[in-house]
């Protein structure tokens, strides 16, 4: 355990005057594990002026860090870095005088309490005054700074002229783009201090660059992917009091593919399963032996799950006979193309025959097969069908 | 060397006030905290409170609480202990305490008799 | 604020092992300080952070402290160890002393 601190298996305090600490508590070396550790409580120690950018990163299960009624005057910048899981910091009665939010706009803090620290009266802190207003909580904090008469003004009362809130505009065409294509984005952003102009782009894959001047930017998407549909493209503003940003989605528009289609499988149903790509959404097409399959109330497609424009389903057939032994082919189509893939399914052989004896399937019509097409999605009439067992889609997501 | 020396003995009435008071040598006076203990005839150890001579930040515990003050001069890297009125059950000796390991560095003691 | 259980007192032959315990709610999550006053003196810190010894002071003290209980040992006690030992804690900001234990050595 660091010198005059305490420790268990996942929290760290030194609250002692004296001794006391000089420096922020390190674990030595085959000691506890630094990862589990979850909280680290400073208090009384007035020697302890600064957290280093290499301090707090070993404790990557930080979630509450407590430095109270002590000497703490600086924290570097990229101090928290490495610390995703801090919930809750507590800065009370401490000697800052500034404080950036950069150690903390990376972080998803619940609570971050700075009372009685002497910040100094200056657009470095406007951010805090921000923070406050965003909250409105009843609990907001009484935070005092100290102007060039060495005067104390609230906080809330702050007025510093050319420090505001930047903002951002993003002038987007149609953000809906066929795939392989290319598309170009333009923002600019606004605001005193100047802000900081950066894109996130979040997990893009398609291959992408950008140009950015002081406010205004741009960014160059080449040979779209069809993966990025639905993607978040962001334009940041970002300087010393805060963030803006502006957002659009990027639909692409691609031909179907069956990235999946398997032999029957038996559950409540038999069930052809598949799985099929494709944005607009693709009207499917199932063919029997090559001819239509129009789908009934025994033998239908079934959606389970959707995933943008992924669709997860079966072809769900009731109580199948050696009748329905078959070739089944699914055609997938829309306006920028089509895909399609076959299997042969064998549910059963024939009557008094061993089961798998006879290679040829029937040559059978259905009855009551038409020619109607299916769009993704149950369409079977169900007003007069019996309550059925299969696994629809019950997300209440649109097939 | 690291040392604390306490101002004499004082003799006093109860209702009287008093400060008496701790200098500091050998060290950086406003780097650590000082502490004041009481002990009364025959009895053992009690904290008072402690002082941080760079900022003032006085502690005290919850028995004298409104009952002393602490207070320091980092100028001449002296602490003090004060009441604006003495009682005779404040009769005790009374010790500073310091140094940057811990506590270890005590100064003599004040002796403070409060009798009518 | 918590308090601190020390015996009264204790007696030791010369040479024996001197353990004076101190005890309080989870004590064992605090520093324990350990203090020596003889008579008309001022007292004299033997321990500290629970095991640390200051500079000057023999080898023969050494402390411990778990659970609810803090112990100073004196290993081949010595008739000038003869003095009132004081355990000592932080509650929160604020010192708190054990009531004393007068060692005595026969």
């Known amino acids: 355990c660091p010198t005059s601190c305490k420790c268990s298996a996942s929290r760290i305090w030194c609250s002692d005057p004296s001794p006391g600490i000089v420096a922020f508590p390190r674990l030595e070396p085959n000691s506890v594990d630094p990862e589990n550790i979850t909280e680290i409580f400073i208090a009384n120690q007035k020697r302890l002026e600064i957290i280093n950018e290499d301090d707090v990163e070993a404790y990557v299960g930080l979630r509450n860090l407590t430095i109270v009624d002590s000497g703490l005057k600086f924290v570097a910048h990229k101090a928290f870095l490495k610390n995703s899981n801090l919930q809750h910091i507590n800065f009370t009665r401490n000697k800052l005088t500034s404080l950036s939010r950069k150690h903390f706009r990376h972080l998803d803090l619940s609570e971050l309490i700075l009372v009685g620290n002497p910040f100094t009266c200056s657009c470095d802190i406007m951010w805090i005054k921000t923070l406050q207003e965003a909250k409105s909580s009843p609990d907001t904090q009484d935070l005092y700074c100290l102007n060039e008469s060495s005067k104390n003004i609230p906080l809330a009362n702050l007025q510093i002229p050319n420090c505001g809130l930047p903002s951002a505009n993003l002038a987007a065409p149609n953000l809906t783009v066929e795939e392989g294509k290319s598309i170009t984005l333009s923002c600019s952003v606004a605001g005193d201090p100047v802000p900081n102009m950066y894109w996130d782009v979040g997990n893009l894959v398609s291959k992408h660059m950008n140009e950015t001047s002081h406010t205004q930017g741009s960014l160059r998407i080449t040979n779209i992917s069809s993966d990025d549909s639905g993607k978040q493209i962001s334009c940041v503003a970002e300087n010393l009091v805060g963030e803006d940003q502006d957002s659009v989605n990027l639909t692409v528009h691609f031909a179907p593919t069956i990235t999946f289609l398997e032999s029957p499988t038996s559950d409540h149903h038999w069930c052809i399963p598949f799985t099929v790509k494709g944005n607009p959404k693709p009207a499917l097409q199932w063919f029997y032996n090559g001819a239509i399959l129009n789908e009934s109330k025994y033998i239908c497609t079934k959606i389970h799950v959707t995933n943008h424009t992924e669709y997860h389903g079966c072809l769900q057939l009731d109580n199948p006979t050696h009748m329905n032994n078959g070739d089944y082919t699914l055609i997938a189509k829309n306006e920028y193309g089509k895909d399609e893939k076959q299997i042969s399914a064998h549910f059963m052989g024939w009557p008094g025959i061993d089961d798998g004896a006879n290679p040829n399937y029937p040559d059978v019509i259905y009855e009551d097969y038409g020619t109607a097409a299916n769009d993704i999605g149950d369409t079977t009439n169900r007003s007069n069908e019996i309550p059925s067992t299969d696994v629809t889609d019950k997300t209440g997501r649109e097939h | 060397q690291v040392q604390l020396l306490q101002s004499a003995a004082e003799v006093k009435k109860p209702g009287e006030s008093l400060k008496i008071s701790c200098k500091g040598s050998?060290?950086?006076?406003?780097?650590?905290?000082i502490g004041w203990v009481r002990q009364m005839p025959g009895k053992g150890l009690e904290w008072v409170g402690i002082?941080?001579?760079?900022?003032?930040?006085?502690r005290y515990s919850p028995s004298f609480q409104g009952q002393v003050t602490i207070s320091a001069d980092t100028s001449i890297s002296t602490t003090y202990l004060q009441w604006s009125s003495l009682k005779a059950s404040d009769t005790a000796i009374y010790y500073c305490?310091?140094?940057?390991?811990?506590?270890?560095?005590w100064g003599q003691g004040t002796t403070v008799t409060v009798s009518s | 604020q918590s308090v601190l259980t020390q015996p009264p007192s204790l007696s030791v032959s010369p040479r024996q092992t001197a353990s004076i315990t101190c005890s309080g709610d989870k004590l064992g999550d605090k520093f324990v300080s350990w203090y020596q006053q003889k008579p008309g003196q001022s007292p004299v810190l033997v321990i500290y952070q629970d095991t640390k010894r200051p500079s000057g002071i023999p080898e023969r003290f050494s402390g411990s402290n778990s659970g609810n209980t803090a112990t100073l040992t004196i290993s081949g006690t010595q008739a000038m160890d003869e003095a009132d030992y004081y355990c000592q804690a932080w509650d929160s900001s604020t010192g708190v002393f054990g009531g004393g234990t007068k060692l005595t050595v026969l």
């Open positions: 050998g060290y950086r006076f406003t780097s650590y905290w």
């Open positions: 002082i941080y001579p760079d900022d003032s930040d006085t």
């Open positions: 305490a310091s140094g940057e390991v811990a506590f270890d560095v």
